[in-house]
């Protein structure tokens, strides 16, 4: 079998809401993945599991099941949303994210995603990690190319 390639493209949008009393930030982060099937047969994308970390703490998880079929030598773009919560010991971030005196409230999040594909009864898992800036101060839609430069934040392999 030839390879199945998974490419994390970046954050597509981040929608933010707050609970001022409990100093909690809710961020719904939609990410985009490109999955390429380099085989001459169809491949099933069984599931995508994702998690988001802030400051080494997992702040959100998501799992999508029975997602799609990718035809021979085809590529599909898949969006998935991870609901995240920044609260409690990280609630100091509430003050930063709601600070009116600054325009952009970027925080660095680590996006982790694992794609499970299946063909002829065989399963394969491909994982990606990427650091991304996300604005926690307002609803933002990103140009996907825009987030590429964050590769500089990737720890060296």
């Amino acid at each position: 079998p030839r390879s199945i390639e998974v490419k994390y493209i970046g954050v597509k949008s981040a929608y933010v809401s707050y609970d001022a009393e409990k100093r909690t930030i809710y961020l719904n982060i939609t990410n985009t993945l490109n999955i390429t099937n380099n085989n001459y047969y169809s491949v099933e994308v069984e599931n995508i599991t994702a998690q988001v970390q802030f400051s080494k703490t997992v702040i959100g998880k998501a799992r999508l099941n029975n997602i799609t079929n990718i035809g021979p030598l085809d590529m599909k773009q898949i969006d998935y949303t991870v609901p995240t919560v920044i609260a409690e010991e990280m609630s100091y971030m509430y003050d930063f994210c709601t600070l009116l005196s600054i325009k952009v409230h970027n925080i660095v999040l680590m996006m982790q995603v694992t794609v499970t594909t299946a063909y002829f009864g065989h399963s394969e898992q491909i994982s990606q990690e990427r650091y991304q800036y996300v604005d926690c101060g307002r609803n933002t839609t990103y140009q996907l190319a825009q987030s590429e430069y964050l590769n500089v934040l990737q720890p060296q392999q």
Epitope: D19, A20, E21, K22, R23, T24, Y26, V85, A87, E88, S91
Partner: antibody
């Protein structure tokens, strides 16, 4: 240390209104939400609502929506609750309470104001 | 509104005994941020209530370690390992997960 000063008693006539005060000291007034809690003699506790002193935003118990109006005066670090159209049912001790940093529990309570509605 | 049901209403104990108070909520007290906002207060006659335990099991500063809180979801318990005279009064549980915030009806801890 944190203090919430409330007047001891208020005697008011039925149908009238009363404005209860709660003067805060010993901390940054705008950082912590202020809650108001009602306790009728020998009874349980009832949450009336709360207010964010930094911007005046309030959350109310629907039961008290037309009864209680919460305000703050940042310059004097004082929270107020106005009770209107008073009846004997409103006779109670009213506590002002400071929330914790996360706005969730009530670590600091005033001594309470006893409101007596009587003609 | 979330109804908080405390049992028993009255709890006669001997000094040095263990005391246990139950608090049950009519719906889960897990907030959308994953935190359970269930607290315990003690009110002595003629005084304001005092915070004992916050967020299920955290003792407030200055509260003796004979007080402990436990539970999850809708069932919660306050335990006093060795009751002392200063512990007598009315205990209230309280939730601040759902608006309006609500209190239990109270449990009176008294000497047998």
């Amino acid at each position: 240390q944190v203090q919430l000063q409330q007047p001891g008693t208020e005697l008011v006539k039925p149908g009238a209104l009363v404005k209860l005060s709660c003067k805060a000291s010993g901390y940054t007034f705008t950082t912590y939400w202020i809650h108001w809690v009602k306790q009728r003699p020998g009874q349980g506790l009832e949450w009336i609502g709360n207010i964010n002193p930094s911007n005046g935003n309030t959350k109310n118990n629907e039961r008290f929506k037309t009864k209680a109006t919460l305000t703050v005066d940042k310059s004097s670090s004082t929270a107020y609750m106005q009770l209107s159209s008073l009846t004997s049912e409103d006779s109670a001790v009213y506590y002002c309470v400071r929330g914790d940093y996360y706005g969730t529990s009530y670590p600091f309570w005033g001594q309470g104001t006893l409101v007596t509605v009587s003609s | 509104d979330v109804v908080m049901t405390q049992t028993p209403l009255s709890l006669p104990v001997s000094l040095g005994d263990q005391a246990s108070i139950s608090c049950r909520s009519s719906q889960s007290l897990v907030h959308s941020n994953g935190i359970t906002y269930l607290h315990w207060y003690l009110q002595k006659p003629g005084q304001s209530p005092k915070l004992l335990i916050y967020k299920v099991s955290n003792r407030f500063s200055g509260v003796p370690d004979r007080f402990s809180g436990s539970g999850s979801g809708t069932d919660f318990t306050l335990k006093i390992s060795r009751v002392e005279a200063e512990d007598l009064g009315v205990y209230f549980c309280s939730q601040s997960t759902h608006v309006p915030y609500t209190f239990g009806g109270g449990t009176k801890l008294e000497i047998k």
